[in-house]
Interface confidence: low
């Protein structure tokens, strides 16, 4: 049976086997097309989600679809039900927390009172002044907290206590990519991880350990990517994996926070990378132990220079490394997080591509997660 399962797939009605290599090849080999059902699926970018959270204390903003203007949510009459609606609009199913925060001196959006209509937040008609003088600070999920803070050094062995959201994404029990837990059901990774194997069956996620071989594997229900854009072949290197059963969070299994929509990181901002990837370019072997390294944001203009990526780094990507080179992600780290710490840890990038590993003028290129928040929320909403 093990051999059969490894090399063949069983079609139903009528029962017959087809070679596994015929799964997800775009051709229907089973009469009801089951061979093309459990495949990496693409999901369009979709409409604008009409709520978002700002880096200014995670304050809630609401879109007026009639004018296209964003407004900050006033705390007046804001309820738990409205908090839940806001989070559901972003695709979260967990219980949110919210509090009042003072309207700051730099408040640049009009502040309006919020109501609900057809499970979407709306601005209250003829909303008067915000009497409380407070905005809504909303957290849809407790995320980005680890048991241990890493020390700032070059490259060193990492502990799962520091990075409880890091997972190993494996095909046929072999580590292929890293990934990050975003919530009990969802793991964030890179789309290019699934280029070779587009059937969902053999993909597994391993969470809760910093050693590659030692943790139980979790079944995957769905793998979702964005539709390919031939104009920008390296863009859209982002994927969401839906787990068959929700994770139980613990000290070593926790989610990382998504970035805020306005998370603009300036050059030299310190960031962290982690992974089990190759320890040497074009050689060495996959690391059995999770490694961590501190890097920094590298200016996109520098990254696109003639001696670097010559314009290949788009607005939906970001560069990180160290100016002198030598610290970088490598093969096998793909899909893992590029992380920024404010109050919590945020996944601001996904390990995507680069020329070589650790070269001074060619740092790592990362998918800019803030550019895909809308897509993530739309996928989650569709799967609620």
């Amino acid at each position: 049976k093990v051999i059969l399962d490894k090399y063949y797939f069983l079609c139903g009605q009528p029962l017959h086997f087809i070679p596994r290599k015929q799964l997800c090849d775009g051709e229907l080999d089973c009469p009801l097309g089951e061979d093309e059902e459990h495949c990496v699926k693409s999901f369009p970018e979709g409409p604008a989600v009409a709520v978002r959270l700002s880096k200014d204390r995670s304050t809630l903003q609401v879109l007026d679809s009639a004018t296209g203007n964003w407004f900050s949510a006033c705390f007046d009459n804001f309820t738990e039900a409205l908090a839940e609606t806001a989070c559901r609009q972003m695709g979260y199913s967990s219980k949110p927390t919210f509090r009042a925060v003072e309207i700051g001196p730099d408040q640049d959006l009009d502040v309006v009172e919020i109501t609900e209509n057809s499970q979407e937040l709306r601005m209250r008609n003829s909303s008067g002044p915000c009497l409380s003088g407070s905005l809504v600070s909303l957290h849809c999920l407790a995320c980005g907290k680890s048991l241990k803070t890493p020390r700032v050094v070059g490259v060193e062995e990492a502990s799962v206590d520091s990075w409880p959201w890091q997972v190993s994404i494996q095909y046929d029990k072999q580590h292929v990519c890293g990934g990050s837990i975003l919530d009990p059901h969802w793991v964030l990774t890179a789309a290019h991880c699934f280029r070779k194997h587009t059937d969902v069956f053999n993909w597994k996620v391993r969470a809760g350990s910093d050693k590659l071989g030692s943790f139980p594997s979790l079944a995957v229900a769905k793998i979702i990517i964005i539709e390919f854009n031939p104009m920008y072949p390296k863009d859209n290197d982002i994927a969401l994996m839906k787990l068959q059963f929700p994770l139980t969070f613990s000290g070593t299994v926790r989610p990382i926070c998504l970035p805020f929509f306005d998370e603009e990181l300036t050059p030299a901002t310190p960031l962290w990378i982690i992974g089990w990837g190759f320890t040497k370019q074009n050689g060495g072997k996959m690391s059995d132990i999770l490694l961590q390294a501190s890097v920094q944001v590298i200016d996109s203009t520098r990254c696109n220079a003639d001696d670097a990526y010559q314009g290949e780094v788009t607005e939906k990507m970001m560069c990180a490394g160290i100016p002198e080179g030598g610290v970088d992600t490598c093969q096998g780290d793909s899909g893992g997080p590029l992380m920024y710490q404010s109050d919590q840890w945020h996944v601001v990038g996904i390990v995507s591509w680069g020329y070589g590993c650790g070269g001074p003028s060619t740092p790592g290129v990362y998918t800019k997660v803030s550019a895909y928040l809308n897509w993530i929320y739309n996928v989650w909403k569709a799967e609620l």
């Epitope: 290599k21 051709e27 229907l28």
Partner: antibody, heavy 116, light 107 residues
Framework: QVQLVQSGAEVKKPGSSVKVSCKAS????????ISWVRQAPGQGLEWMGR????????SYAQKFQGRVTMTRDTSTSTVYMELSSLRSEDTAVYYC?????????WGQGTLVTVSS | DIQMTQSPSSLSASVGDRVTITCRAS??????LNWYQQKPGKAPKLLIY???SLQRGVPSRFSGSGSGTDFTLTISSLQPEDFATYYC?????????FGGGTKVEIK
């Protein structure tokens, strides 16, 4: 995705035979079932039969039994459909299509004209 | 052989219209039904398989439903590129048989 390329148009006399080829690329040839479907001018689609992926076993529609032969040449990744005792009502575009049950890849079609 | 009857045989519609095509099998075929689109001079293109599964790369405005003997293809908002002939096909048993086709024309 599989690409299927068919041979060119043919003009045949009634009573003769025609052999249309369909060359596959972009996948493991031995795993493909190839169906043949024809379409008379201005008419609908008609399934003629299929040749199965391994071993070359065939299944023909009753209507064409005895007149149609489907074969394959694995060395060139090509499938052939031969229709004999042609009559004027066999004038049609003949398509090869990949799949036993539904076909997501089709050849470009081969027009066979039967005329005296 | 299983007979497949499609209706209407032709229809006129405008861009943005919701279009529904029906297909009836002469005996129960469970959900072993496919829908194809064909444009003049071109090979058919698979839209829907297993009655309701959207083929990869086909726009989501196309949807299929039904089981047993009665099936429906719906185009939620007709686009200029959707003017074509649509065929249903049963894959329950050989010989595989097609419906007579529905030509969707511009009003």
């Amino acid at each position: 995705q599989v690409q299927l390329v068919q041979s060119g148009a043919e003009v045949k006399k009634p009573g003769s035979s025609v052999k249309v080829s369909c060359k596959a690329s972009g996948g493991t040839f031995s795993s493909y079932a190839i169906s043949w479907v024809r379409q008379a001018p201005g008419q609908g689609l008609e399934w003629m039969g299929r040749i199965n992926p391994s071993g070359g076993s065939t299944s023909y529609a009753q209507k064409f039994q005895g007149r149609v032969t489907m074969t394959r040449d694995t060395s060139t990744s090509t499938v052939y459909m031969e229709l004999s005792s042609l009559r004027s009502e066999d004038t049609a575009v003949y398509y090869c299509a990949r799949g036993r049950y539904s076909s997501s890849s089709w050849g470009q079609g081969t027009l066979v004209t039967v005329s005296s | 052989d299983i007979q497949m009857t499609q209706s209407p045989s032709s229809l006129s519609a405008s861009v943005g219209d919701r279009v529904t095509i029906t297909c009836r099998a002469s005996q129960s075929i469970s959900t072993y039904l496919n829908w194809y689109q064909q444009k003049p001079g071109k090979a058919p293109k698979l839209l829907i398989y297993a009655a309701s599964s959207l083929q990869r790369g086909v726009p989501s405005r196309f949807s299929g439903s039904g089981s047993g003997t009665d099936f429906t293809l719906t185009i939620s908002s007709l686009q200029p590129e959707d003017f074509a002939t649509y065929y249903c096909q049963q894959s329950y048993t050989t010989p595989l048989t097609f419906g007579g086709g529905t030509k969707v024309e511009i009003k």
